[in-house]
């Protein structure tokens, strides 16, 4: 199934003019993601059933090794480049989680809605970050890494990877919301 974000190499061929108050919109999107991250995380690990809710540190700890770094004390340009990498990584990861959860928890309406809503906001955020990078800093290319592919994993590994990723997402989005 298609991923919620299909990343492309950033080029400065922006088809539409950037949104007014672009940084305000980026801040607003980060605030909304931050506001909903905890609910998504709890809903996710609860929906997985045992042993997840009682083993959060072990199974859902935010130890995601290849997660892109973020430095809150950098320049706006540096922070936006790092934010771009993080959003691409999260977008592909969420796509995998959503795909897996549709199979593993087909009737979890609220979980699916929150995963999809998060992916939608991330899509808009990615577009705004790209617009800002191109229009203000003329950055036309950002090297990115994508989230881990879970398609070949067993059920438990899929659940665990998703839980770790959402734990990391919750932690990271709080930092990002503060940094901008």
């Amino acid at each position: 199934s298609p991923l919620p974000i299909t990343p492309v190499n950033a080029t400065c061929a922006i088809r539409h003019p950037c949104h007014n108050n672009l940084m305000n919109q980026i801040r607003s999107q980060l605030a909304q993601l931050n506001g909903s991250a905890n609910a998504l995380f709890i809903l996710y690990y609860t929906a997985q059933g045992e042993p997840f809710p009682n083993n959060l540190d072990k199974l859902c700890g935010p130890n995601v090794t290849d997660f892109p770094p973020f430095h809150a004390n950098g320049t706006e340009k540096a922070k936006l480049v790092e934010l771009y990498r993080i959003v691409v990584y999260l977008g592909t990861s969420l796509g995998n989680i959503t795909r897996d959860q549709k199979i593993l928890n087909p009737s979890a309406l609220s979980l699916h809605s929150k995963l999809n809503a998060t992916a939608d906001i991330l899509r808009g955020l990615l577009s705004n970050v790209l617009c800002r990078l191109c229009s203000k800093y003329h950055v036309g290319h950002v090297d990115v890494t994508y989230g881990p592919d879970t398609s070949g994993k067993d059920v438990f590994q899929k659940k665990k990877l998703g839980c770790q990723l959402l734990g990391k997402y919750k932690e990271t989005i709080a930092v990002l919301a503060q940094a901008f």
Epitope: G35, S36, A39, L43, L109, S110, K114, N116, A117, D120
Partner: antibody, heavy 120, light 107 residues
Framework: EVMLVESGGGLVQPGGSRRLSCAAS????????MFWVRQTPEKRMEWVAY????????YYPDTVKGRFTVSRDNAKNTLYLQMSSLKSVDTAIYYC?????????????WGQGTLVTVSA | DIVMTQSHKFMSTSVGDRVSITCKAS??????VAWYQQKPGQSPRLLIY???FRHTGVPDRFTGSGSGTEYTLTISRVQAEDLALYYC?????????FGGGTRLEIK
């Protein structure tokens, strides 16, 4: 402007059936999931049905599961609620509701409502 | 199911005053709370979602706050047109549930 207009309410005998309709306009109907929410005479609010934008997924609370069926006709921009085995506790104003964005779980746009009275 | 409790059925206030309407969830709902206003003879209107985000067009005198199980809708400078019934709703998990409502009366 988002417009939702419910119809089909009226007096129904206990055990009877009724089909409500909701005509939608002012937005791309097929892009949004839709909800039915009801308000009892005592002013209590209750979510009663959800249907995905394509109509392939539906959800109901236990209070109406097995008795109510939500459906939609995207070609006609119309939402339906088929109610059967009606009870007096089903007496309420029934609202057709749209979320603000595709996956939101709060109720942004409401119709004017249609009153269903279940009584002998 | 998650039970949403609005302990005050009625609240009385004066124009220009600040009023806070409270809502308590039977479990932690992680900010997944919306608030609605229903004026007499009208359909409900969305004010707030995710506990503190104002819906489009909602005046900034309406503010949502809270966390865990306790949530508050505050109207900072009450106006005569704020006479209405106010509901909270949890959008944390299905079935989505509402509080019983708080009727705001203007003295």
């Amino acid at each position: 402007e988002v417009m939702l207009v419910e119809s089909g309410g009226g007096l129904v005998q206990p055990g009877g059936s009724r089909r409500l309709s909701c005509a939608a306009s002012g937005f791309t109907f097929s892009s949004y999931p839709m909800f039915w929410v009801r308000q009892t005479p005592e002013k209590r609010m209750e979510w009663v049905a959800y249907i995905s934008n394509g109509g392939d997924s539906t959800y109901y609370p236990d209070t109406v599961k097995g008795r109510f069926t939500v459906s939609r006709d995207n070609a006609k921009n119309t939402l339906y609620l088929q109610m059967s085995s009606l009870k007096s506790v089903d007496t309420a104003i029934y609202y057709c509701v749209r979320p603000s964005a595709r996956y939101d779980e709060w109720f942004a746009y409401w119709g004017q409502g249609t009153l269903v009275t279940v009584s002998a | 199911d998650i039970v949403m409790t609005q302990s005050h059925k009625f609240m009385s206030t004066s124009v220009g005053d600040r009023v806070s309407i409270t809502c308590k969830a039977s479990q932690d709902v992680s900010n997944a709370v919306a608030w609605y206003q229903q004026k007499p003879g009208q359909s409900p209107r969305l004010l707030i979602y995710w506990a503190s985000f104002r819906h489009t067009g909602v005046p900034d005198r309406f503010t949502g706050s809270g966390s865990g199980t306790e949530y508050t809708l505050t109207i900072s400078r009450v106006q005569a047109e704020d006479l209405a019934l106010y509901y909270c709703q949890q959008h944390y998990n299905t079935p989505y549930t509402f509080g019983g409502g708080t009727r705001l009366e203007i003295k």
